[in-house]
């Protein structure tokens, strides 16, 4: 028996369902009574779900997993993981034994898009050219950690005087706060881009500072 899984990681959004694909080629005359299918966490060997002794033994992993029972006899040993969480990320091993045995591992990469950044200024009034201003770009509830880029109105990257902090909340999602300290010119637009490296999703925020009231 040869077990096959996808070589590329499975990317799943937080709170959605994911399918970890695993298949094998049943011999003629194969019976489900002969099948021993075990899904486990690769590193710890913790049992996730199993089908043994001719029956689905159920989820051993927070009751959020399921097999595709009607497809098992055709060699489909895939695992459905419901309501994906950040803590589900990692490698899962699909072990199949009938008479012979084989196993293969598939990686689950969890992701969550970042919110549109909100921009704040300090100070936020009586701004004059030559003043030092602090611009904060905040984006929330993303995963994994973001990449943050700053640019001026001409698209020139701003790398000096940037401090970025990322804090995980109780669900493991990150809130990003990036602070740019800059000396004001006569007029200026400052843009912040928050990129999710897994989803290749960019969230943009900008602020334009003129002699007039500020525009966000």
């Amino acid at each position: 028996v040869e077990v096959q899984v996808s070589e590329d990681p499975v990317v799943a959004l937080v709170d959605t369902d994911a399918t970890l694909r695993c298949s094998f080629s049943p011999e003629p005359g194969f019976s489900l009574a002969q099948l021993n299918l075990i899904w486990q966490l690769t590193d710890t060997k913790q049992l996730v779900h199993s089908f043994t002794e001719g029956r689905d033994q159920g989820s051993a992993y927070s009751n959020r997993t399921a097999l595709f029972p009607d497809l098992l006899v055709q060699g489909n040993a895939s695992l459905r993981l419901q309501r994906v969480r950040v803590t589900d990320e990692g490698s899962y091993t699909c072990f199949v034994s009938i008479q012979d045995f084989d196993s293969a591992a598939v990686s689950l990469q969890v992701a969550a898009p970042y919110s549109k950044p909100s921009m704040t200024l300090e100070p936020n009034k009586d701004l004059r050219p030559g003043n030092m201003v602090t611009i904060t770009c905040s984006s929330y509830q993303g995963y994994p950690e973001a990449e943050v880029f700053w640019k001026d109105g001409q698209g020139v990257p701003l790398t000096g005087n940037v401090t970025t902090s990322q804090m995980a909340n109780e669900r493991g999602l990150f809130d990003v706060h990036s602070v740019l300290r800059v000396v004001l010119g006569a007029n200026g637009t400052y843009s912040c881009l928050v990129r999710n490296p897994v989803l290749q999703q960019d969230a943009h925020g900008s602020v334009t500072i003129t002699g007039q009231p500020l525009t966000f």
């Epitope: 002969q34 002794e53 034994s97």
Partner: antibody
Framework: EVQLLESGGGLVQPGGSLRLSCAAS????????MNWVRQAPGKGLEWVSA????????YYADSVKGRFTVSRDNSKNTLYLQMNSLRAEDTAVYYC???????????WGEGTTVTVSS | QSVVTQPPSASGTPGQRVTVSCSGS????????VQWYQQLPGTAPKLLIY???RRPSGVPDRFSGSKSGTSASLAISGLQSEDEADYYC???????????FGGGTKLTVL
């Protein structure tokens, strides 16, 4: 006739190496998973290692992990067990076993004796 | 110390019925098929029961296997002198990724 014949056992000093072979006949070796099982003098059976038909998935008992290596040559119908860093507690009769996860360990060789002693 | 536990010895008189137990856990005996092996003195083990309760061809129907929860049993009815041997249970353990054998039970026919 279905048969498994082990060879390569003998006396070896602690820290030494030995390579066991198992010649299979009478069944489709290339389609069968295989086990090594050992039995120390006067003791019970202890599983050592399992290898699938293609040699792509292998498991070891914790007691031998990192010291023993199982392999197979399907063109020669032969199973191997390379034993390094041998210890006195590895002294045992080593059995080559045809493994079927459903039908069980249905064919056993007669065993070969490994003695680790100075 | 075996992951799967068997009584070290059992005995019976000819014609009697004896039972050998095999106690494991949810990661082996409790959720996997159990096999039983007979080892006559000075010989290699022989498969006696597979898939918990099935007999290979050639094994007398005096031998039977069963399971309840995380314990399996081998029953031998109509005990005969040639049944004097060591008996081992075995199962795959999915938390160890290993085959586990019971420590063995020496059956004596009195």
């Amino acid at each position: 006739e279905v048969q498994l014949l082990e060879s390569g056992g003998g006396l070896v000093q602690p820290g030494g190496s030995l390579r066991l072979s198992c010649a299979a006949s009478g069944f489709t070796f290339s389609g069968s998973a295989m086990n090594w099982v050992r039995q120390a003098p006067g003791k019970g059976l202890e599983w050592v290692s399992a290898i699938n038909s293609g040699g792509t998935t292998i498991y070891y008992a914790d007691s031998v992990k990192g010291r023993f290596t199982v392999s197979r040559d399907n063109s020669k119908n032969t199973l191997y067990l390379q034993m390094n860093s041998l210890r006195a507690e590895d002294t045992a009769v080593y059995y080559c076993v045809k493994l079927d996860f459903y039908y069980g360990m249905d064919v056993w060789g007669e065993g070969t004796t490994v003695t680790v002693s100075s | 110390q075996s992951v799967v536990t068997q009584p070290p010895s059992a005995s019976g008189t000819p014609g009697q019925r004896v039972t050998v137990s095999c106690s494991g856990s949810s990661s082996n005996v409790g959720s996997k098929y159990v096999q039983w092996y007979q080892q006559l003195p000075g010989t290699a083990p022989k498969l006696l029961i597979y898939a918990t309760d099935r007999r290979p061809s050639g094994v007398p129907d005096r031998f039977s296997g069963s399971k309840s929860g995380t314990s399996a049993s081998l029953a031998i009815s109509g005990l005969q002198s040639e049944d004097e041997a060591d008996y081992y249970c075995a199962s795959w353990d999915d938390s160890l990724n290993a085959w586990v054998f019971g420590g063995g039970t020496k059956l004596t026919v009195l």
